[in-house]
Amino acid sequence: MMTGTIETTGNISAEKGGSIILQCHLSSTTAQVTQVNWEQQDQLLAICNADLGWHISPSFKDRVAPGPGLGLTLQSLTVNDTGEYFCIYHTYPDGTYTGRIFLEVLESSVAEHGARFQIP
């Protein structure tokens, strides 16, 4: 039985050209995390594997950095980075847990005057 829950940063916004940290946290389970996949829609961004450590997909190497922790840092943001991001926790014996984050990348002037989703 899957008892765990994933907490995420939820809906967030960032400024074009800036960077953002995507974070998920799995709680309420004693299952062993064997792998965390970070995906944007259907594209694999990165994998953090318990045995092998981090691997960033080649097409994102210049703009994606591992961490902190099991999170992911996106750099040099563009408006095209707006969209859904998923953290997929592979665990044993529970199975797979998925968290969703929506990122909105705003033009600099818009971000300065208050975004819809603010990080406290």
Partner: nanobody, 119 residues
């Protein structure tokens, strides 16, 4: 389901060398890494080395760094482990491992290949 067949084990004296091979069949497109684990009598299975198919970067357990070298032939879905300067504590059954984006590490193991290092 991926099938793993290991070979190349044997009996060798301390300081000697062996080269292990693992051929994987039934490989899926989401296979992203291959590697090796080992299990000594009475001990838990432990990670030895891994290699990412994209870019070929490698990861080693501290206990084998500088002595073991992992390599792969992606076209053949085969991974190799060159083991030099072997020590008696390297004695174990060596198992091939695969990692996929869908499942993480394989749940099913091959039969393994026995490596025995005598002093």
């Amino acid at each position: 389901e991926v099938q793993l067949v290991e070979s190349g084990g044997g009996l060798v004296q301390a300081g000697g060398s062996l080269r292990l091979s693992c051929a994987a069949s039934g490989v899926t497109l989401d296979l992203y890494a291959m590697g090796w684990f080992r299990q000594a009598p009475g001990k838990e299975r432990e990670f030895v080395a891994g290699i990412w198919r994209s870019g070929g970067s490698t990861v080693y357990a501290d206990s084998v760094k500088g002595r073991f070298t992992i390599s792969a032939d992606n076209a053949k879905n085969t991974v190799y482990l060159q083991m030099n300067s072997l020590k008696p504590e390297d004695t174990a059954v060596y198992y091939c491992a695969t990692w996929t984006t869908t499942w993480g590490r394989n749940r099913d193991w091959g039969q393994g290949t026995q490596v025995t290092v005598s002093s």
